[in-house]
């Protein structure tokens, strides 16, 4: 069982337990911050990020941000707390096992973002319309 002095941790956001006292392990996410990308006009892309990290806090999820402007294309992969906005946007899809890109309005660039909560799920980013959340099959996957 979990030692009592671990549960009485000062920094309680680092420890999340269920009713049986089991401690939640953080998400495993691709974490390369911002890198140049060749991902363009594809249904899905791999992140080409070789770094998988244990997220710092148990509540964090995996996030990917794809940006295109006149100069370049970048892909950002990070861990982030879904209770907090990222790039001024709420992570609406944090419970999804897949990282399904949704376009966000940003002046001067094309901006897509996704979030998800399965191992290294931000390694495979999906742009295809067939994965739109209006698809009942996807909702089944997400909420199973």
């Amino acid at each position: 069982t979990i030692p009592p002095h671990v549960q009485k941790s000062v920094n309680n956001d680092m420890i999340v337990t269920d009713n049986n006292g089991a401690v939640k392990f953080p998400q495993l996410c691709k974490f390369c911050d911002v890198r140049f990308s060749t991902c363009d006009n594809q249904k899905s892309c791999m992140s080409n990020c070789s770094i998988t990290s244990i997220c710092e806090k148990p509540q964090e999820v995996c996030v990917a941000v794809w940006r295109k402007n006149d100069e370049n294309i970048t892909l950002e992969t990070v861990c982030h707390d879904p209770k907090l906005p990222y790039h001024d946007f709420i992570l609406e899809d944090a419970a999804s096992p897949k990282c399904i890109m949704k376009e966000k309005k940003k002046p001067g660039e094309t901006f897509f973002m996704c979030s998800c909560s399965s191992d290294e799920c931000n390694d495979n980013i999906i742009f295809s319309e067939e994965y739109n959340t209006s698809n009942p099959d996807l909702l089944l996957v997400i909420f199973q």
């Epitope: 069982t1 979990i2 269920d18 049986n20 006292g21 089991a22 401690v23 939640k24 392990f25 096992p97 909560s117 399965s118 199973q144």
Partner: nanobody, 124 residues
Framework: EVQLLESGGGLVQPGGSLRLSCAAS????????MAWARQAPGKGLEWVSL????????YYADSVKGRFTISRDNSKNTLYLQMNSLRAEDTAVYYC?????????????????WGQGTLVTVSS
């Protein structure tokens, strides 16, 4: 009864090395992911490293990447943490922990059994 017993902690100078061991009993060791976590004095729990049941996949926190190596010997029911290039901020009680369920896939990892910990002090 599940038991996890850590050993190998102690006092080491900055830049030094230590190898922690965790002897497991009371469950089928090779079926379960195992992890190391640590708690520095007055701080929260920090997950350090995770290893898959068969030992082929390993993961690390950014703070220890490139310095720590997790491994396991399933024939000896033992988990290891090799710690190199130790820093003062690595000072903590180190715990090994067992994943609650053996299943993989889209399920939240939860760890239900913990050792009592071994103290690592990095100081000159």
């Amino acid at each position: 009864e599940v038991q996890l017993l850590e050993s190998g902690g102690g006092l080491v100078q900055p830049g030094g090395s230590l190898r922690l061991s965790c002897a497991a009993s009371g469950f089928t060791f090779f079926n379960y992911e195992m992890a190391w976590a640590r708690q520095a004095p007055g701080k929260g729990l920090e997950w350090v490293s995770l290893i898959s049941a068969e030992g082929t996949r390993t993961y690390y926190a950014d703070s220890v990447k490139g310095r720590f190596t997790i491994s396991r010997d399933n024939s000896k029911n033992t988990l290891y943490l090799q710690m190199n290039s130790l820093r003062a901020e690595d000072t903590a009680v180190y715990y090994c922990a067992k994943r609650r369920d053996a299943s993989m896939g889209h399920t939240t990892r939860r760890f239900d059994y913990w050792g009592q910990g071994t103290l690592v002090t990095v100081s000159s």
